[in-house]
Interface confidence: low
Amino acid sequence: FERTRSLQDPCSNCPAGTFCDNNRNQICSPCPPNSFSSAGGQRTCDICRQCKGVFRTRKECSSTSNAECDCTPGFHCLGAGCSMCEQDCKQGQELTKKGCKDCCFGTFNDQKRGICRPWTNCSLDGKSVLVNGTKERDVVCGPSPADLSPGASSVTPPAPAREPGHSPQ
């Protein structure tokens, strides 16, 4: 009986952008301003996200999709759907509660976000330092003395991504 009733549910005919209005004999009513329904058959519309303060509107809300926010210049998104904005720092710095702080000697940060990471230790690979590290850049390892020959590569592999949620490949 329940299955039969659900198959005949008039709300299932309401498309995205509308809601099934119980106060009006379950007819499909359009979502009111500043609300949306992204799927059909919904009994209410969801309130649109408002991008205020440090948040900036990247995509306006429509009757079928929520607004999308990003961050004002000088800030970057954190979390799913840009749920937070965090202050940018300069390369060579990390963000602390007291603000941006220079990387300690022996560490670097080549991004405007995240923490300072230790320089590569070239000697672990039996290589020598070709270019010294800075607060903003990792060291560049060169060939070991035994490898010094024409065409020897002096470029290290790319540094690990430091973005949260970096997708595995």
Epitope: L95, T96, I115, P118, T120, N121, L124, D125, D138
Partner: antibody, heavy 119, light 111 residues
């Protein structure tokens, strides 16, 4: 699917060394830092150090400096943690843990390797 | 060697809420928004429950939430379930030479 597979349990005598391995699969090995964390029986978690599998750079907790060496083999996507001059208080489960984020947290963990130090 | 202080135990009945605290200093918890929480069942590896103070990885129920005030971070578990019984550890990035620290751990009992 991301997996970190650690080597089997070890029994060592005081003064010896142990080398634990952690083979990574299911993601690009050189794109994520790896940490080692240990846990003595009935005790809490203790951070030991971090290795950058791309360049091989390491950073160790002060407590372990001089006794621990972390290395990696990019051809097999494996990181290693060697602890020397073992003593009874080094008896613990040793975990490798992947670091995906800007703030240094641990999203995937190995199953752990029990190292027992006993005479 | 532990830097972050947690209560040794906490308890609650099914359906109730429980909050576990994690107290550090301005050099770790208070200085960065890089606090994470881990759940560990006996004989198992830890599992990430919260990162960056309040973010939940996919697959972690929304009953788990994190927050921070000053030098103290908190993990709140609402609608307690039997499977929530485990040890919980906080962790933080720190500006000290030891770059990552853990809490002392809290044993959660579901009554």
């Amino acid at each position: 699917e991301v997996q970190l597979l650690e080597s089997g349990a070890e029994v060592k005598k005081p003064g010896a060394s142990v080398k634990v391995s952690c083979k990574a699969s299911g993601y690009t090995f050189t794109s994520y830092y790896m940490h080692w964390v240990r846990q003595a029986p009935g005790q809490g978690l203790e951070w030991m150090g971090i290795i950058n599998p791309s360049g091989g750079s390491t950073s160790y907790a002060q407590k372990f400096q001089g006794r621990v060496t972390m290395t990696r083999d990019t051809s097999t996507s494996t990181v290693y943690m060697e602890l020397s001059s073992l003593r009874s208080e080094d008896t613990a489960v040793y975990y490798c843990a992947r670091d995906p984020g800007a703030g240094g947290y641990f999203d995937y963990w190995g199953q752990g390797t029990l190292v027992t130090v006993s005479s | 060697s532990y830097v972050l202080t947690q209560p040794p135990s906490a308890s609650g009945s099914p359906g109730q809420s429980v909050t576990i605290s994690c107290t550090g200093t301005s050099s770790d918890v208070g200085g960065y928004n890089y606090v994470s929480w881990y759940q560990q069942h006996p004989g198992k590896a830890p599992k990430l429950m919260i990162y960056d103070v309040s973010k939940r990885p996919s697959g972690v129920p929304d009953r788990f939430s994190g927050s921070k005030s000053g030098n103290t971070a908190s993990l709140t578990i609402s609608g307690l379930q039997a499977e929530d019984e485990a040890d919980y550890y906080c962790s933080s990035y720190t500006s000290s030479s030891t770059r990552y620290v853990f809490g002392t751990g809290t044993k959660l009992t579901v009554l």
